[in-house]
Each structure stands twice: as C-alpha cells, then as structure tokens.
Interface confidence: low
C-alpha cells in the first residue's frame, strides 16, 4: 500500500522536511502533491510527468519545494503555516489513480525563558511567592527545577497556568534555593537562568552563649547572642529588665555578686518586624577563702603517735576533700576521716607518712586547694651499719670505720672499743694499726628526740697471718636445671686476693660460672649433676696464704627415665618373672609398679612366680623424687606363651 512518511514528523521553523514515499507502484504516468487531506486543484503544490521528466508548479507552490523522481517531496525553510496534511496523487500508466496522505507539525525554536516573581522578599510562614516562566509560548511544556532537582512533592508547592506558574505557599527558610524553569516543545528545550529565592525569616528564639550560668566573683562576663534571621537580626541586651546596649555581645569585666540576675537578649528583624527574646539567669558566687591545714602534732614519733590534720576554716554545708602525694586518699586502716571529712587522722604514723597532704573545699564551680603540708615524723635510729665490711686487717694500715643509722632527726653517734667510749663521731679513724687494735668495735646511734638508741658490734682482727677461710653457700641442696648456687669465701679481708678450685683444678671456663665481689663470690647458674664436686677457696696477701676445707655440692636431680631389666618381653608359661627398675636420681627415688594400670607394690623389684598367659600385659614402673618434686615412668609389654609354643626365658 502506498504510504507517506514525514522525516522528521516534528519540524523546527527554518529547517526542512522530507515527505518520503513508500511502496510507489511501477508503470507510472506521473504524480502530483497537494496541501491538505484531499486532491484539490486549487491547492496543488507541484505535478510531475515521468515520461517528460517535467515538473509543473501548482497554485500552492512556494518555491521552497523540490520533487524527486521517486515522488518524495522536500520542503525547505519551513514556516509555521506549513503544518498539516500533504496528499500524494499517483496516476498509474493505466490511468488508475492512487492516493496517500502524510503530515508533519511545525514548531518554533523556543527562546531562553526567564522567571518573573510576584514577591522578591517573601516573609517566612506568611507570604506566598508565585514564579512565572516567561514568555508564554503556545504548545510548550513548562518544567521547574529546584537546586537542579525536579520539584519535590509538597502540599506547599502548586503548579498552575499550564505549569507555567509555580506558587510556594507559606514560604519557609528552607525554600531559599535556586529555581529554574524550562520550556520544552517537540523540537527544542531551553532552561532559564537561576533565580535565588530570598526568604525573610526570623528572628528565631535567640541562643545565648556560653551556656554556663555560674561565675565566680572577679571573672569577666562575656555573653554572645545569636538568632537565625534574614536579614541578620539587630540585638539588644537587658539586665533585670533594664536596657543595657544594642550589641550582639555583652561584656562586663570583674563581675561581683551584684551582677547576678536575669540577662535578656532581644533579637529584632527590621524586615519581618518580629522580635524574639531569650532569658538566661546568671549567678555570681563569692570567692571562698583558701583552705589551710592545722595539725595537732607537728613532730609525731613513728609507731607511737597519731596525728590529726584538720582542714580550716570550718564552713557549714561544705564538702571537704583530701589528697596524699597528689592522689586521693588510699584505703588504709590507719587513715580515718571524721563524719564531715574535715579531719584526717593518721593512726600510728610511720616514716612513710610524711606526705605532702592537701585539703580542698568544694564549691559550686570548682575545688579550692590548700597549700601542701609535710609531716615531720620522728623515727629511728634503726640498727646502725658499719662500713667497710672487712674484719681482717694487716698491721701498719689505717683503720677507717663509718657508721650510719636511718633516723629523724639525724642520729648522734658514739664509738666504743671493747666496751670503752672512744669518741662521739660518725667516723672512727685509727692510723698505723697493730695487733693490739684487734677487738670489739661498737657503734652506738642515738636519737635525741625519741630518746632511742641502737648499737652494732663488729669484730676487727689485726694480724699479719691470714686466717683459714671457709665457704658459705646460699643453697645447700640446689635442684638440677633450676637453681643457682652462690659460694662466698669468708672472711672479707682488706688487700686480699681470692682464688677458687674445683676438684683440685683451677676454675674451668664456662658461661654458667661467674666470679664477683672481687672474686670472693663464685656463682654457678643452672646447676647440673656434674656440678656435684669439691669446691675450695683460697685467700692470699703479700705475707701469707690459706685454703678452705673443701665443700661438696649436693645437687638434687632426677628421676631420669627409668630402665626395666632384663630387656626381654617374651616369656614361657611357668617361668618366674623378675623385673628390676632403675632411675638415676638424687636422692634415690621411690619406686612403684602397675600392671595393666592396676597399682602393685612400692618396690624396686617386681617378682611374680610361675607366670601364665594371664600375666600378659603392660608393666609400668613409676619413679618419684620427693626432693625435686619430679616424677617419671616407663612402660614395658610382657607376653607369656603357653609351654612349647615359642622360645623364651625361664628364671
């Protein structure tokens, strides 16, 4: 069937359109185009005779039409009047007519739209704003954009006038946005420049900052007020209802209790004509006195006296706080607080209770601290120590002994030799000593405040000959692979060389052997059973030398994994079973046996006469060393065969 296709169907003014013919019959005489839906000679555009290839313009020809041999019609420089139907009249060679009608629509190219507004400064929650998209254009579709998004669904938004007008009812500050309109028709789409809606709002209820309402006397009061408002609000301050100033900030230096009261900020928007106020109540507190500590005993004696510390002044309905060494009070049965926390009692003071102590008074705003107080605890003297620790000296050297005892106040010292007072000094010095200076040297420490005295006695031997040394040990029964042993060669003597021997040989080089204290101490780390040897120490100086008696180290070890003998595991029925268990251990271990898990006897040897196949099973030997606390075991399987079935041993 003959059809007409318009390309394009929607044509912009000034452009061109092609009326394309489909299914054109063969054997044609010619064809003619008409404006309209029917063949009307008065509205003929152009006729075409194929045989002569002659095109003849008709009454409706505008000079913008071109006809093609395939009957298609091109219309150029389209105008609005070209809209409508076009009919092709085909005359076949047999002069039979055929008609087809096509159509197209002409639309103008749209201009760039603009937005007009009926209210450039609408007031929030009061005004409505109507935006209109200009110009009004026929056959155009109007669209709206808010912040480049399509319109949100809202009962406050209404489109009218064929969507050309957008009305925002009861505008809010949130409607402050970028608005654009767009015009569309089938051939073009144009978007307007954005219009920013300037909504007048507020002032909202102002906020006063900072939020705190409590101040101390002497501080500066600096209040700032802010209210959301467009245009920005004008601010006024009132104190207790009296106007102060028209500023956003209120500053009062060095406030007093008299500045307490209600502070009102008023925000005014000259465009909306609205006022909003916010009130804050400011309380100014008087500065409390700085606390201080009094004590009922300024020089308490250790382990005797109690001390009561009191926080002054006494103020009713006040919270008292205490700190020791800059920390809150530790839990201790020796610390007691009074009901009001004002008095802290230290029962039976010690030298560690010196402090410092602080008390505090808590008020509405902060905690005021006292100055720290330190206790002067009287203690000691402790047992004095005499140094150096040498007990043997050679004639001709100088003897210089020093005495010290922990004490508060510091101790007074006295020296006695063989019970006779020598001098009241902390140090005792005797030059060029002889054997006659041997004796008992006593240091006496005295605390004048507590009246206590303590003494220490040291035996000093002055001799050219060195004494026979002896070995002391810090562990007489060390455990293998666990303990260390420190041997010390006694006595400690001045200008003396210390030597060591093991089993009569000089010390082997070993990372487990360490000499210290001027070679006077020999330490064996991680002892092993091989360290159970004879140890001898020697001392020598330029005049004499001497050796100690040997000391044998008794290393506890084991039990090692036991061995069951004989090794056989197959026996003939009727034989005697005689199993012996042995484990290396010091001291000797305790033995026990289990057969198939059942405890048997606590002996080293297990004997069973005339065994049978019933004695088949697992035989376990358990060993235990009570000194090392260690245990061990071994399991052996025994098979008993009926006589004659397999070779075996008989006991």
């Amino acid at each position: 069937k003959l059809t007409i296709e318009s390309t394009p169907f929607n044509v912009a003014e000034g452009k061109e359109v092609l009326l394309l013919v489909h299914n054109l019959p063969q054997h044609l005489f010619g064809y003619s185009w008409y404006k309209g839906e029917r063949v009307d000679g008065n509205r003929q555009i152009i006729g075409y005779v194929i045989g002569t290839q002659q095109a003849t313009p008709g009454p409706a020809y505008s000079g913008r039409e071109i006809i093609y041999p395939n009957a298609s019609l091109l219309i150029q420089n389209i105008i609005q009047n070209d809209t409508g139907f076009y009919t092709l009249h085909v005359i076949k060679s047999d002069l039979v007519n055929e008609e087809a009608t096509g159509q197209f629509r002409v639309y103008p190219e749209l201009p760039k739209p603009s937005i007009s507004s009926n209210n450039s400064k609408p007031v929030e929650d009061k005004d409505a704003v109507a935006f209109t998209c200009e110009p009004e254009t026929q056959d155009a579709t109007y669209l709206w954009w808010v912040n480049n998004q399509s319109l949100p669904v809202s009962p406050r938004l209404q489109l009218s006038n064929g969507n050309r007008t957008l009305t925002l009812f009861n505008v809010t500050r949130n409607d402050t946005a970028s608005y654009k309109c767009e015009t569309q028709n089938p051939v073009s789409a144009r978007r307007s420049d954005s219009v920013i809606l300037n909504v007048l709002y507020g002032p909202d209820a102002p906020t006063i900052s900072p939020l705190n309402t409590s101040y101390r006397s002497g501080e500066n009061l600096n209040l700032s007020c802010h209210a959301a408002s467009n245009p920005p609000a004008q601010y006024s301050w009132f104190v207790n209802g009296t106007f102060q100033q028209s500023t956003q900030e209120l500053f009062i230096p060095n406030i007093t209790v008299n500045n307490s009261g209600s502070y009102t900020c008023q925000a005014h928007n000259s465009d909306t004509g609205l006022n909003r106020t916010t009130v804050t109540t400011i309380t100014v507190y008087a500065e409390p006195p700085k606390p201080f500590i009094t004590s009922n005993n300024s020089n308490p004696v250790e382990d005797e006296d109690a001390v009561a510390l009191t926080c002054e002044p006494e103020i009713q309905n006040t919270t008292y706080l205490w700190w020791v060494n800059n920390q809150s009070l530790p839990v201790s049965p020796r610390l007691q607080l009074s009901n009001d926390n004002r008095t802290l009692t230290l029962l039976s003071v010690t030298r560690n209770d010196v402090g410092p102590y602080e008390c505090g008074i808590q008020n509405e705003l902060s905690v005021d601290h006292s100055d720290p107080v330190i206790l002067n605890v009287l203690y000691g003297p402790d047992d004095p120590t005499i140094s150096p620790s040498y007990t043997y000296y050679r004639p001709g050297v100088n003897l210089s002994l020093s005495c010290h005892a922990a004490s508060n106040p510091p101790a007074q010292y006295s020296w006695l030799i063989d019970g006779n007072i020598q001098q009241h000094t902390q140090e005792l010095f005797i030059s060029n000593i002889t054997e006659k200076n041997s004796g008992l040297y006593t240091c006496q420490a005295n605390n004048s405040a507590s009246g206590h005295s303590r003494t220490t006695v040291k035996t000093i031997t002055v001799s050219a000959e060195l004494p026979k040394p002896s070995i002391s040990s810090n562990n007489s029964k060390p455990v293998e692979d666990k303990d260390a042993v420190a041997f010390t060669c006694e006595p400690e003597a001045q200008n003396t060389t210390y030597l060591w021997w093991v089993n009569g040989q000089s010390l082997p080089v070993s990372p487990r052997l360490q000499l210290s204290n001027g070679n006077r101490t020999l330490t064996l780390f991680n002892v092993t059973r091989n360290d159970a040897r004879a140890y001898v120490c020697g001392i020598q100086n330029s005049v004499s030398a001497n050796r100690s008696d040997p000391v044998t180290l008794d290393v506890l070890y084991g039990p090692d994994t036991p061995i069951i003998s004989p090794p056989d595991s197959s026996y003939l029925s009727g034989a005697n079973l005689n199993l012996s268990c042995h484990s290396a251990s010091n001291p000797s271990p305790q033995y026990s046996w289990r057969i198939n898990g059942i405890p048997q006897q606590h002996t080293q040897v297990l004997f069973i006469a005339k065994i049978t196949p019933n004695n088949n099973g697992t035989y376990a030997c358990f060993v235990s060393n009570l000194a090392t606390g260690r245990n061990n075991s071994i399991v052996k399987s025994i098979t008993v065969s009926a006589s004659g079935t397999s070779p075996g041993l008989s006991a």
């Epitope: 808010v146 912040n147 998004q149 949100p152 669904v153 809202s154 009962p155 949130n174 946005a177 909202d204 209820a205 906020t207 959301a228 909003r276 916010t278």
Partner: antibody
C-alpha cells in the same frame, strides 16, 4: 533541662469529654510547635495534632478533626488537648512533644511520660 | 498522607550482632536533599526516645553504635553491635508534612 509533664487522663464513657494538660519547663513553648501523639494499647504511634503557641494556629489528624481541640497558654508554658465526643478507639496513652528548630531540631526529641485515657462504658 | 513501612516486623538477634532496620516512605520526605525522617526507640511502659534525627544525625546522649542513613524514600537504622539494653521496639517517623506519620514499628528481640 527540658521536661514535659502530661496530666488529665482517666476513665470516661463514650461520648464524654476530657482535657489533657502538658506542662513544659526548660524552654519557652512559644519557640516551638507543641504536638500530641497517642499510642493505643499494643499498637504503634499515631500523630494527633499540633499547635503553634505563638499564634494559636493548629492542625489535626483526620481521625480526631472536629472532636479534639489543641490550645496553649504561653504564660503558663502549657499546652492542652480538649477531647470531646470520645470513642472507644480513642483509648490510648497520650504524649506531648515539642517540635522546632531550637528545642528539638525538627524532630520529636523530648517526650513526656504520657497520660492514659480509657474510653469505656 | 505519607505512609511509612518498616521491615522486618520482628528481628531476632543475639547481643554483639549487627542489626539493620529499614523504613520506606510512600513518597520522598526530602527537603532540598535532607530527609525529614527520624528513628525512635521505645521500651515497654516508657515513652519513645529519639535516636536519630533527620536521617543520619545522632541525638544527644545516643551511643555511637547507633547510626542512620538514607534519603528520599529509603532509610536504614543500623546498630553495629547489640547491647542487652538495645532490645526494644523501633519506630521511624516523618515530619516532612502534615499529618506527621510513624511506621508500624520493628520489634528487636533476643534470639
């Protein structure tokens, strides 16, 4: 500190009336909208209505329109819910909640403890 | 009227697990890109308590394990690691337009 205390609930016969109060402290109700929300036993939350105490404008849910009236007394910082022609389906716990930029940032941030209304013959 | 649909109706989880609650609005509740959708928690015999306002803002005093997300019509409340005190009924509510509406609630119960 923001506080809301509802009162006035109780047992009432169908067709009867009740007046609920919502006393606010810690803020000025003029700065907010005051909403009423109810919760029937074992059910969810249902918005009843709201008032702008600054100008008295109010809005209502369809289910209570024409029967309930919301009012406010800014001098007492209190909102009210007058309930007339009560029905069994009005049985619920009634809450009041402020709503606005400064007090609740456009959400119902503060709620009273609720007052119970029982409509039964 | 904007209808809010919450899912699931009941959620059974154990303490320490992550909870995800959904709220779908019948139409967009955004005003210039901000969702006027809020989440509330309610325990038996107590008033509702605001958890999240305007989609994703945690209300004062609400622990950091609660978070909100979403815009337009789809919103989510997430509890990253459930504590025993979190088992309650959760409602979403919109203040986009009158009448204000709430979801039917999601009951979060101990598994």
């Amino acid at each position: 500190e923001v506080q809301l205390v509802e009162s006035g609930g109780g047992l009432v016969q169908p067709g009867g009336s009740l007046r609920l109060s919502c006393a606010a402290s810690g803020f000025n109700i003029k700065d907010t909208y005051m909403h009423w929300v109810r919760q029937a036993p074992g059910k969810g939350l249902e918005w009843v209505g709201r008032i702008d105490p600054a100008n008295g404008n109010s809005k209502y849910a369809d289910s209570v329109k024409g029967r309930f009236t919301i009012s406010a007394d800014t001098s007492k910082n209190t909102a009210y819910l007058q309930m007339n022609s009560l029905r069994a389906e009005d049985t619920a716990v009634y809450y009041c909640a402020p709503f606005g930029y400064y007090v609740s940032d456009y959400a119902m941030a503060y709620w009273g403890q609720g007052t119970t209304v029982t409509v039964s013959s | 009227e904007i209808v809010l649909t919450q899912s699931p109706a009941t959620l059974s989880l154990s303490p320490g697990e992550r909870a995800t609650l959904s709220c779908r609005a019948g139409e967009s509740v955004d005003i210039f890109g901000v969702g006027f959708l809020h989440w509330y928690q309610q325990k038996p015999g107590q008033a509702p308590r605001l958890l999240i306002y305007r989609g994703s803002n945690r209300a004062t005093g609400i622990p950091a394990r609660f978070s909100g997300s979403g815009s337009g019509t789809d919103f989510t409340l997430t509890i990253s690691s459930l504590e025993p005190e979190d088992f309650a009924v959760y409602y979403c509510g919109q203040t986009y337009e009158d009448p204000y509406t709430f979801g039917q609630g999601t009951k979060l119960e101990i598994k």
